[in-house]
Amino acid sequence: SPVPFGPEGRLEDKLHKPKATQTEVKPSVRFNLRTSKDPEHEGCYLSVGHSQPLEDCSFNMTAKTFFIIHGWTMSGIFENWLHKLVSALHTREKDANVVVVDWLPLAHQLYTDAVNNTRVVGHSIARMLDWLQEKDDFSLGNVHLIGYSLGAHVAGYAGNFVKGTVGRITGLDPAGPMFEGADIHKRLSPDDADFVDVLHTYTRSFGLSIGIQMPVGHIDIYPNGGDFQPGCGLNDVLGSIAYGTITEVVKCEHERAVHLFVDSLVNQDKPSFAFQCTDSNRFKKGICLSCRKNRCNNIGYNAKKMRKKRNSKMYLKTRAGMPFKVYHYQLKVHMFSYNNSGDTQPTLYITLYGSNADSQNLPLEIVEKIELNATNTFLVYTEEDLGDLLKMRLTWEGVAHSWYNLWNEFRNYLSQPSNPSRELYIRRIRVKSGETQRKVTFCTQDPTKSSISPGQELWFHKCQDGWKMKNKTSPFVNLA
């Protein structure tokens, strides 16, 4: 495989050295200005010190300039996501310069070798940017480096080496192996640009994490917790999108970052929001749907600059395909129990009814366990915009079918054979929309009928004004 030589990152194909025709030394990195929406078009190759191609290819010095940086490659060809991203950028920013950084010869190697080449590729990009800065009207502030996987760290090096500060770097699932826990100057970091935003879509706490787990930007967004992406499971991929193996599942999840970014470019009317949270579990509990103090942001291209934040972890749920936007809701449910039946967790579902649409039957995911005689918070999300919420239906499906729960059922039955029934009392549900930040309280229609048992349902409507004042007494006062 070809390897770089010298500080300029020159390339020689050692594999074919004996042939005289193979010893020609060439720059290891090429810059292709995509001049047409036609993905087959060869574009224009730019090189430092050669101004003619800039004129011939109508390089717009005052416009935004995007540099797309691919990652490690097993095939040595540009993957299909590349022209999708190029096309999306052209669609969104019609006057912009879109440059593809072709470092395929240095990326088409053993992963460890490709990692060792990232620095030299970053240097090449920095040299190109330094040269462009010599031109009138070109501003580094208008430069946006978009790096996928290993390319994200290349972007970091470029931002580090360039004279001045690049406007923005977007890291699309930055590579994890050999970068996790690395020194700030040996990976993408917030210091590499005026604004560094990152999408993490393949992080794993067990096994090999293809994407980096640690936050490396000003804002680090973890869609679906940054790990299992909807539509990328083996079941989903076997019958579609040409992904039929574990390798393809990995590819699907890793590449999801690119598609989320493309989505943010082309579906401007359906922007996805992410919410700041300390960890994925807290987000899954529905605790983190606040937009106060810049705690929420658009994802992808539409992300708002937040330079005061560093390594701010943000979360969201998404659909399985474009448009990825979902609508997040926080449900605060105060649960009392008439008959506490041990550790068995109820399997609860909610259906939301809105002015525009109704949701499906949505599971209330129990992240840890339901606390009785306490307020429990849940996160639910819908794929469609329901509009204003009008009412909701809560159903109890009985116990979750795990061996643990079945054993608990049996144990509880043995300990209280005379009273095996279980009952929850839920008087009201407070709902907050993540997208609109609106809060609405829903009450049972009849305060005296607020109990639910397995196999039953309970309906909630918007609370009447003053309902809470009238019903201040606890339903349990006479139960002693």
Partner: antibody, heavy 120, light 112 residues
Framework: QIQLVQSGPELKKPGETVKISCKAS????????MNWVKQAPGKGLKWMGW????????TYTDDFKGRFAFSLETSASTAFLQINNLKNEDTATYFC?????????????WGQGTTLTVSS | DIVLTQSPASLAVSLGQRATISCKAS??????????MHWYQQKPGQPPKLLIY???NLESGIPARFSGSGSGTDFTLNIHPVEEEDAATYYC??????????FGGGTKLEIK
């Protein structure tokens, strides 16, 4: 106009070596990848692999690893296919075909083909 | 590797009629709304010639009587009305992401 012109027919004995050329014109040679495709007599098309015309890095499919070598003479805008230790089953017509690095990788221009006959 | 199965292996169609050739892939060749399936025509003693790219796009200079359709795993090449010069062997090819890229076995079209 864009053309890929291949070298003439070859008659070889088993165990010998052959080198087929494919000269490109009408476009910037290094801006497109070059494929090689085999077609045995009366059979279908079989993709052998491709070469990056800029870096010179070849990629071979599993069936064509070992005796087959893709190479370049960039200054002459020419790609080569060399087959070593020829066998009877190498008797076929070999085509070069270009593809765009940036698009959907279909083969838009083909050489006229070089017929190789391997016989003792 | 993705296997492409063409059917029929050969067909005879009367002048002016419709010829329909099918290509089935062993797994989807779609990617984000695009189908990476292409069709070529090869006449005896000649190299293949690109007719249709990305399932349904007509290559420039190819007559409009050629059309392609399909997505996922099922693709079709239609020729209507068939002309004398269309007698040839037709191949489908997939180039979805990582190689190896593969060709179908070919369909020989004869004009009655």
């Amino acid at each position: 106009q864009i053309q890929l012109v291949q070298s003439g027919p070859e008659l070889k004995k088993p165990g010998e070596t052959v080198k087929i050329s494919c000269k490109a014109s009408g476009y910037t040679f290094t801006n497109y990848g070059m494929n090689w495709v085999k077609q045995a007599p009366g059979k279908g098309l079989k993709w052998m692999g491709w070469i990056n015309t800029y870096s010179g890095v070849p990629t071979y499919t599993d069936d064509f690893k070992g005796r087959f070598a893709f190479s370049l003479e960039t200054s002459a805008s020419t790609a080569f296919l060399q087959i070593n230790n020829l066998k009877n089953e190498d008797t076929a017509t070999y085509f070069c075909a270009r593809f765009s690095y940036y698009g959907r990788h279909y083969f838009d221009y083909w050489g006229q083909g070089t017929t190789l006959t391997v016989s003792s | 590797d993705i296997v492409l199965t063409q059917s029929p292996a050969s067909l005879a169609v009367s002048l002016g009629q419709r010829a329909t050739i099918s290509c089935k892939a062993s797994q989807s060749v779609d990617y984000d709304g695009d189908s990476y399936m292409h069709w070529y025509q090869q006449k005896p003693g000649q190299p293949p010639k690109l007719l249709i790219y990305a399932a349904s796009n007509l290559e420039s200079g190819i007559p409009a009587r050629f059309s392609g359709s399909g997505s996922g795993t099922d693709f079709t090449l239609n020729i209507h009305p068939v002309e004398e010069e269309d007698a040839a062997t037709y191949y489908c090819q997939q180039t979805n992401d990582d190689p190896p890229w593969t060709f179908g076995g070919g369909t020989k079209l004869e004009i009655k």
